[in-house]
C-alpha cells in the first residue's frame, strides 16, 4: 500500500544536477522526513537530508538544497560531482515519520534511459523517400487486403463469418511511462514479493486532507497501487516513480476494500488515517 511516492529527475539545464521529489499520501501529521541514498535509512542507506517541519532542515553532500514543497512533500536538489555520474544508478529513499504511529518509506531511482526533462527518450524513426514510401505502402495495403479477403472467403465455406470486434487499444498504455516497483531487495523478503497485484484504485482526490494540508502535487495523483505496482504497469506520469508499500514498501496479497473518505490513491483507496501505525522507524 503505497503511502510515499518518490520521483527522481535529471535537470534539463544542468546534466550534473538531479532532483529527488518525495511526498506522503495521507492525512497523518509528519514529524520528520529523511532522504537517503544507496538504500533505506537505517538499512544500508546514507542520509542525504533530514527535514523537520519546525526545527528546519539538515543536509549532507552531495545534497545541495532540501526544502518543503507542500506540507506533505519535499524536494532535494543534488549536485553530481561529474565524471562517473553515480546518481544515474543510485536508489534514493524517502521516509516520512508520524510519531508514534509509524514510518513509511519508499525508494526510487532515475529511469535507465532518462533524457533531461523527458519522461522517455524519443524513438528514432528511419527516414524513407516519400515516393518509395507511397509505392511500398500502397502495395502493402493491396496485398494485405487481397490476402485478408481470400482468408475470409476460405473461412466462409466452413462457417458463417464471425463479427469482428474492434480492438480496444489503451491509448494511455501506449503513451505512458511505466512506473516500476522499487529496487528489489537482495534479502529474502518475506519471501520476496512473489506475486504482483496490478489492480488500481481510482486515482482521484475528491476531498481535501482532513487536516487541511495543501493538495498533493499533480504527479502524485497517479501511482502504482500496492506492493504491487507491476513493473510493466504503465501510468501516465513524468519522471521516475517508485513506490509499491510503502509496503510501506508491501508484498502482494489481498487489499482492504475501498471504503475510505476522500483521498483515494491507495490500494485500499483510503490511505492511512491520521494514526495508522505502521512502522515507526525514524
Amino acid at each position: 500500500t503505497p503511502e510515499v511516492w518518490v520521483q527522481v529527475q535529471m535537470e534539463a539545464t544542468e546534466l550534473s544536477s538531479f532532483t529527488v521529489h518525495c511526498g506522503f499520501l495521507g492525512p497523518g501529521s509528519i514529524s520528520l522526513v529523511t532522504v537517503s541514498w544507496g538504500g533505506p535509512d537505517g538499512a544500508g542507506g546514507t542520509k542525504l537530508a533530514v527535514l523537520h517541519p519546525e526545527l528546519g532542515t539538515r543536509q549532507w553532500a552531495p545534497a545541495r538544497q532540501a526544502r518543503w514543497e507542500t506540507q506533505s512533500s519535499i524536494s532535494l536538489a543534488l549536485e553530481d560531482s561529474g565524471a562517473s555520474s553515480p546518481f544515474a544508478n543510485t536508489t534514493f529513499c524517502c521516509k516520512f515519520a508520524s510519531f508514534p504511529e509509524g514510518s513509511w518509506e519508499s525508494c526510487g531511482s532515475l529511469p535507465p534511459s532518462s533524457d533531461p526533462g523527458l519522461s522517455a527518450p524519443p524513438t528514432p524513426v528511419p527516414i524513407l523517400r516519400a515516393d518509395l514510401a507511397g509505392i511500398l505502402g500502397l502495395s502493402g495495403v493491396l496485398l494485405f487486403g487481397c490476402g485478408y479477403l481470400l482468408h475470409l472467403l476460405r473461412r466462409q465455406k466452413h462457417r458463417p463469418t464471425p463479427r469482428l470486434q474492434p480492438s480496444h487499444t489503451n491509448s494511455q498504455a501506449l503513451t505512458a511511462q511505466a512506473w516500476a516497483p522499487s529496487q528489489a531487495s537482495q534479502a529474502a523478503l518475506h519471501d520476496p514479493y512473489a506475486t504482483i497485484n496490478t489492480s488500481f484504485c481510482p486515482a482521484t482526490l475528491d476531498t481535501a486532507h482532513p487536516n487541511g494540508w495543501a493538495s498533493l502535487p499533480t504527479h502524485a495523483a497517479h501511482q502504482p497501487q500496492g506492493p504491487a505496482a507491476s513493473a510493466s504497469t504503465p501510468i501516465l506520469a513524468r519522471g521516475s516513480f517508485v513506490s509499491v508499500e510503502n509496503g510501506l514498501y508491501t508484498q502482494a496479497g489481498e487489499r482492504p476494500p475501498h471504503t475510505g473518505p476522500g483521498l483515494t490513491l491507495f490500494p485500499d483507496c483510503r490511505g492511512p488515517r491520521a494514526v495508522e501505525g505502521r512502522f515507526g522507524v525514524r
Epitope: 500500500t1 503505497p2 514529524s31 538504500g39 533505506p40 535509512d41 537505517g42 538499512a43 529513499c93 521516509k95 510519531f99 508514534p100 504511529e101 509509524g102 514510518s103 513509511w104 518509506e105 519508499s106 525508494c107 516497483p181 522499487s182 529496487q183 528489489a184 531487495s185 534479502a187 529474502a188 523478503l189 518475506h190 520476496p192 514479493y193 506492493p227 517508485v242 513506490s243 509499491v244 508499500e245 510503502n246 509496503g247 510501506l248 514498501y249 508491501t250 508484498q251 496479497g253 489481498e254 487489499r255 482492504p256 471504503t259 485500499d268 483510503r270 492511512p272 488515517r273 494514526v275 495508522e276 501505525g277 505502521r278 512502522f279 515507526g280 522507524v281 525514524r282
Partner: antibody, heavy 122, light 106 residues
Framework: EVQLQESGAEHVMPGASVKMSCKAA????????MYWVKQRPGQGLEWIGT????????SYNQKFRGKATLTVDESSSTAYMQLSSLTSEDSAVYYC???????????????WGQGTSVTVSS | QNVLTQSPAIMSASPGEKVTITCSAG?????MHWFQQKPGTSPKLWIY???NLASGVPARFSGSGSGTSYSLTISRMEAEDAATYYC?????????FGSGTKLEIK
Amino acid sequence: EVQLQESGAEHVMPGASVKMSCKAAGYTFTDYWMYWVKQRPGQGLEWIGTIDTSDHKTSYNQKFRGKATLTVDESSSTAYMQLSSLTSEDSAVYYCARDFIITVNYPVVDYWGQGTSVTVSS
Amino acid sequence: QNVLTQSPAIMSASPGEKVTITCSAGSSVNYMHWFQQKPGTSPKLWIYSTSNLASGVPARFSGSGSGTSYSLTISRMEAEDAATYYCQQRSSLPFTFGSGTKLEIK
C-alpha cells in the same frame, strides 16, 4: 546482528519503583523508535508506550500514564522504562521492541528483547 | 480504546489441516497486524498491514480482512505453527492487541 538485551528479573516490594533497561546493538540506535509491551502471566499483550530515540518524544497508553516513564540514553544506546508505585497488578514480563518500518521491496522485520520479569510481592 | 476480540481462544488442528483465526475490532481499523508467540519466547511480527508476511514467515500463512473483521489463515497446518497468535491495531491510540488465540497441534 540486531540485538535488544533487557535487564534481569526483578523482585520488588509493593509501593516501590523499578527501572529496567533495554540495550540495543547491531544498528543505529536513533534510527528506530522503541516501544514497550506488558504481558501478565498467561495473559495477552498490552502496549505501554513508544519513545522516539532521537528526540526523546514519548507517547503513552493512557492506562500507563503516571505508571511508566520511558527514557533513552543515546550514548549507551539504551532505552529505559521506570515503573512506579508498584502493585501486584504490575507483576508481568515487560518487553522492549524496536519499532518496525515498511520499506518497499525490503524485508520487514521486528526485533524484541527477551523480556524483563517483574514480580511485586511482600 | 478499540477492543480486539479474537476467536477461537484455543483451537487444535491436525497437520495439513486449514486453520483460520479471526480478529474482530470494536471499531473500524485500516489494517491489522499479527504476532506469533511461542511459550517462553518474545512475540514476533508475523503479518503486517493485514496481508503481508513478515520476513521469514512461510507462504502457507496469509492474512485478509477489512473494517472490523480480519483473519489469519494457515493453508496447511504444520507442527511448527503451534503457538499463540495476537492481532494488533495501530489505527487509533492506544494501540491494542487481541486477547490471543492459542493454536495447538493434534
